[in-house]
Interface confidence: low
């Protein structure tokens, strides 16, 4: 390609004509903003091609980037064309006017840009400043570009001196944008709601700073579509929001939400759904089973425990035979009700050092406008046994007893068993259990009594020894679910009688 | 002012069924709660079962459940309690009662609106 005049830079006058001539062995054509100028386009006798560009009436707006390419670029390398730059300087322009997107430069990394203020006069001196700023910049500066360099996130303006009047360029905005991988959270503010009550959901974005959020709703495939409001987290930087209110909800709200978020600079994107359910009205559920028989050991520390759902959050009150409790000032009993999620709670009593007293009928209840459960339970202390005494006696008939009295709570058995060889027993003989009704030479007789005070059971067994000739050991074991003891007593044979 | 008139009382052998009837008047009922309790003699009023009138969810007592069915009837402003496999321990006096917000179809008390009860009386 052959460009007469072949510049790279003009200057040339107001209000001139001039002929800018481009030739080349293809067709050729002059392009000037991405466009075709009104040109005259020929071929000669020796197969050259040639355009005409005539600029009649020259202004300072004609002040730019002229270009001669091939109008058919087929077979031929694209990157041939010639670059004219063409100076109108003209006091009535100032600086050359900017489409508007020009005017907003958006970054996505640290990285030189170009604020592009040019003016139609090569000699003029143009400074770069804050916008708010005096002090110019020292940024260099190409006439035919404008100022380039590294900036950071301001307003810029550029300023000359045309005669004797200062002139300012449009504002040019820098922005650099957050951009990373999309990174979206959705939550409720209740996932579940009585109909009549609010459903409002939340999306939040991390790391970016332009995004486009599309909700679904079951409401939005019925046609009703709700706006969603998005707005900028300020405290926390790029967290951006959208917010899906609907009031006064339906049963048919009831479903899943979705928000999908994309990114447009590099064209991420990411979805993230929840689950929302609408119901009549609120709910107590028992999640589990308690039976209604529950054990706690005396003077040991116990903890009864329930598991429930409910919505809204419920009141819990716990009663002792009909009366409520509340957490005792000397710290015997404490109530615990806590949210494990959204919906499910977890109620505790808890008896501290559990004393006879507290055995009886508790109940837990829970409640609200809508609904209310309860649970009951009776509640068993039980007391490990102890042998309270263990006597031998000799009555008239010859015979001889060994009683054995204990207590304990749940009611407990009671094993009698003896040892005659006194020097290896127990360690080497294994006694011999007793009273069992095949054996002649020994009875038994069992008394069992329940202390509705002390709620426990008192045990009383009379043993009857019809033949000891030799000393014997006796022992008595108390046993039930929470322990055992043992007493032992040596019956030595009655004394033979004295004659005279 | 709303009136509940209950109906369909009476002795029945252990084993059988009745149906206890309850209508209801002075207002449209859509939005209510209406419900079925019980009191035998000595004893605390009872909760039964209840139903929503707009949507009709149903909820029982462990007592009913399997053996009572609540069910209303709009268009006739009525409320039945279809009673099977009676006990003798099913003897009281039945209520209708009325709440105006649904939401309490639930709650085992304070209902707005009583009936004036229908006595049942199972014979072993």
């Known amino acids: 390609l052959v460009v007469t005049p072949p510049g790279p830079e003009l200057v040339l006058n107001v209000s001139s004509t001039f002929v800018l001539t481009c030739s080349g062995s293809a067709p050729v054509v002059w392009e000037r903003m991405s466009q075709e100028p009104p040109q005259e386009m020929a071929k000669a006798q020796d197969g050259t091609f040639s355009s005409v560009l005539t600029l009649t009436n020259l202004t300072g707006l004609d002040t730019g980037e002229y270009f001669c390419t091939h109008n058919d670029s087929r077979g031929l390398e694209t990157d041939e064309r010639k670059r004219l730059y063409i100076f109108v300087p003209d006091p009535t322009v100032g600086f050359l006017p900017n489409d508007a997107e020009e005017l907003f430069i958006f970054l996505t990394e640290i990285t030189e840009i170009t604020i592009p203020c040019r003016v139609t006069d090569p000699q003029l001196v143009v400074t770069l400043h804050e916008k708010k700023g005096d002090v110019a910049l020292p940024v260099p500066y190409d006439h035919q570009r404008g100022f380039s360099g590294i900036f950071e996130d301001r307003s810029y303006i550029c300023k000359t001196t045309i005669g004797d009047r200062e002139v300012d360029s449009d504002a040019y905005y820098v922005y650099r944008l957050q951009v990373s991988s999309i990174n979206v959270s959705v939550n409720a503010v209740q996932t579940v709601v009585r109909q009549g009550e609010n459903i409002t959901l939340m999306c939040i974005v991390i790391g970016n700073e332009v995004v486009n959020f599309e909700w679904t709703y079951p409401r939005k495939e019925s046609g009703r579509l709700v706006e969603p409001v998005t707005d900028f987290l300020l405290d926390m930087p790029y967290h951006i929001r959208s917010i899906l209110h609907i009031p006064s909800a339906e049963l048919e709200d009831s479903g899943t939400y979705t928000c999908n978020v994309t990114e447009s600079v590099n064209d991420h994107q990411d979805e993230k759904a929840i689950n929302i359910t609408v119901v009549e009205s609120g709910y107590v559920r028992l999640l589990g089973e308690v039976g209604t028989l529950q054990f706690a050991e005396l003077h040991r520390s116990r903890t009864l425990q329930v598991v429930f759902e409910a919505y809204p959050p419920p009141t819990v009150l716990w009663f002792k035979d009909n009366r409520t409790l509340g957490d005792s000032s000397a710290g015997e009993i404490a109530l615990s009700t806590r949210n494990v999620s959204e919906t499910r709670y977890v109620s505790e009593l808890t008896l501290v050092r559990v004393k006879v007293a507290e055995a009886g009928h508790y109940t837990m209840r829970a409640f609200h406008e809508d609904a209310e459960v309860q649970l009951s339970f009776q509640l068993q202390i039980n007391v490990p046994v102890r042998v309270l005494e263990l006597s031998e006696s000799h009555p008239d008939s010859g015979e001889q007893t060994v009683r054995c009295r204990g207590r304990g709570m749940p009611q407990p058995n009671i094993i009698w068993s003896a040892c005659r060889d006194l020097k290896r027993c127990p360690r080497e003989l294994p006694p011999t259990l007793l009273g069992n009704s095949s054996e002649e030479e020994s009875q038994l007789e069992t008394n069992v009594t329940y202390w509705e005070e002390e709620q426990e059971f008192e045990v009383v067994s009379t043993l009857r020894l019809q033949h000891v000739d030799r000393p014997l050991s006796v022992r008595c074991t108390l046993r039930n679910a929470v322990g055992q003891d043992t007493q032992e007593v040596i019956v030595v044979p009655h004394s033979l009688p004295f004659k005279v | 002012e709303v009136q509940l008139v209950e109906s369909g009382g009476g002795l029945v052998q252990a084993g059988g069924s009745l149906r206890l009837s309850c209508a209801a008047s002075g207002r449209t009922f859509n939005g209510y709660a209406m419900a079925w309790f019980r009191q035998a003699p000595g004893k605390e009023r009872d909760f039964v079962a209840s139903i929503t009138w707009s949507y009709g969810y149903t909820y029982y007592a462990d007592s009913a459940q399997g053996r009572f069915t609540i069910s209303r009837d709009s268009a006739k402003n009525t409320v039945y309690l279809e009673m099977n496999s009676l006990k003798p321990e099913d003897t009281a006096v039945y209520y209708c009662?009325?709440?105006?917000?649904?939401?309490?179809?639930?709650?085992?008390?304070?209902?707005?609106?009583w009936g004036q009860g229908t006595q049942v009386t199972v014979s072993s």
């Open positions: 009662a009325a709440d105006p917000k649904a939401s309490r179809f639930r709650i085992l008390r304070q209902y707005a609106h």
